[in-house]
């Protein structure tokens, strides 16, 4: 039975040209995290594998940095970066957990972080 929950940074906003950290955290399970995939809508951004380490998709290498931890840092943000991001936790023996983050990239200097929320 899958007992874990994914806590994410929820709905967040950031300034154009700035950077943002996307973070997910898996809790309430003793399952071993074997891999975390980060996706932006229909694009694979990066993978963090427990044995192989990080793989950043070449087309995002200039603007995506691994970490902190299992998180992902997006740099030099543009308005086109607005949208849904998913952290997909592959675990053993539980299976797959998915967290969702919505990022809005703003032209103005007013960019406040949203509250955290949980996805069971």
């Amino acid at each position: 039975m899958m007992t874990g929950t994914i806590e994410t940074t929820g709905n967040i906003s950031a300034e154009k040209g700035g950077s943002i950290i996307l973070q997910c955290h898996l809790s309430s399970t003793t399952a071993q995290v074997t891999q975390v995939n980060w996706e932006q809508q229909d694009q694979l951004l990066a993978i963090c594998n427990a044995d192989l380490g990080w793989h950043i998709s070449p087309s995002f290498k200039d603007r995506v940095a691994p970490g902190p931890g299992l998180g992902l840092t997006l740099q030099s943000l543009t308005v086109n970066d607005t949208g849904e991001y998913f952290c997909i936790y592959h675990t053993y023996p539980d299976g797959t957990y998915t967290g969702r983050i919505f990022l809005e990239v703003l032209e103005s200097s007013v960019a406040e972080h949203g509250a955290r929320f949980q996805i069971p």
Epitope: Q32, T34, Q35, L44, I47, D51, Y92, P93
Partner: antibody
Framework: EVQLLESGGGLVQPGGSLRLSCAAS????????MNWVRQAPGKGLEWVAG????????YYADSVKGRFTISRDNSKNTLYLQMNSLRAEDTAVYYC???????????WGQGTLVTVSS | DIQMTQSPSSLSASVGDRVTITCRAS??????LNWYQQKPGKAPKLLIY???SLQSGVPSRFSGSGSGTDFTLTISSLQPEDFATYYC?????????FGGGTKVEIK
């Protein structure tokens, strides 16, 4: 240099058994998921089975489920495919392939031919 | 199971031509789509992974695009060594599945 070398193919009668091996070298075998892919003569590629690097979880194509068993021995850097109840339609070249991140297959062996015929 | 449909099944082209092969998935597979090249009697060779990432050592005339259900492999200027069969493959879920292949022949 990454190398994958399959062996164990040959001629077998319908209903018979065969065990294929894939000897890996040039990389940390235990860190990678591995797959078996086959190709019938003149046909396309068909994934047969896969085994995860971490959990050892095994996955099979419907066409071989219950007849084939994938396994690995990380101490010997070797991948196996035990094939039972073989049928004529299992005739193919069998390739082992390395699967980093469970997303792609970047290195393939040269293949070993399995012929099931009476 | 996810079905992968490749088109065309074969094509004739000349050296220097721009060649496009398409692959369609029966459901969304995000960008979990790979392209392989196979020559007669040889093992498949990875060209493009995760829809658009060029595998190390593969010439830059090969490129991949697409996401969701529709994907494309493009060879910008066909070279003599590119005459082969090309396969797409999804890794979104098991069972992993391949397209039927596209044979690129000399015109």
């Amino acid at each position: 240099e990454v190398q994958l070398l399959e062996s164990g193919g040959g001629l077998v009668q319908p209903g018979g058994s065969l065990r294929l091996s894939c000897a890996a070298s040039g990389f940390t075998f235990s860190s990678y998921s591995m797959n078996w892919v086959r190709q019938a003569p003149g046909k396309g590629l068909e994934w047969v089975a896969g085994i995860k690097y971490s959990s050892g979880n095994k996955y099979y194509a419907d066409s071989v489920k219950g007849r084939f068993t994938i396994s690995r021995d990380n101490s010997k850097n070797t991948l196996y495919l035990q094939m039972n109840s073989l049928r004529a339609e299992d005739t193919a070249v069998y390739y082992c392939a390395r699967g980093p991140y469970d997303v792609w297959m970047d290195y393939w062996g040269q293949g070993t031919l399995v012929t099931v015929s009476s | 199971d996810i079905q992968m449909t490749q088109s065309p099944s074969s094509l004739s082209a000349s050296v220097g031509d721009r060649v496009t092969i398409t692959c369609r998935a029966s459901q969304s597979i995000s960008s979990y789509l790979n392209w392989y090249q196979q020559k007669p009697g040889k093992a498949p060779k990875l060209l493009i992974y995760a829809a658009s990432s060029l595998q190390s050592g593969v010439p830059s005339r090969f490129s991949g695009s697409g996401s969701g259900t529709d994907f494309t492999l493009t060879i910008s200027s066909l070279q003599p060594e590119d005459f082969a069969t090309y396969y797409c493959q999804q890794s979104y879920s098991t069972p992993l599945t391949f397209g039927g292949g596209t044979k690129v022949e000399i015109k």
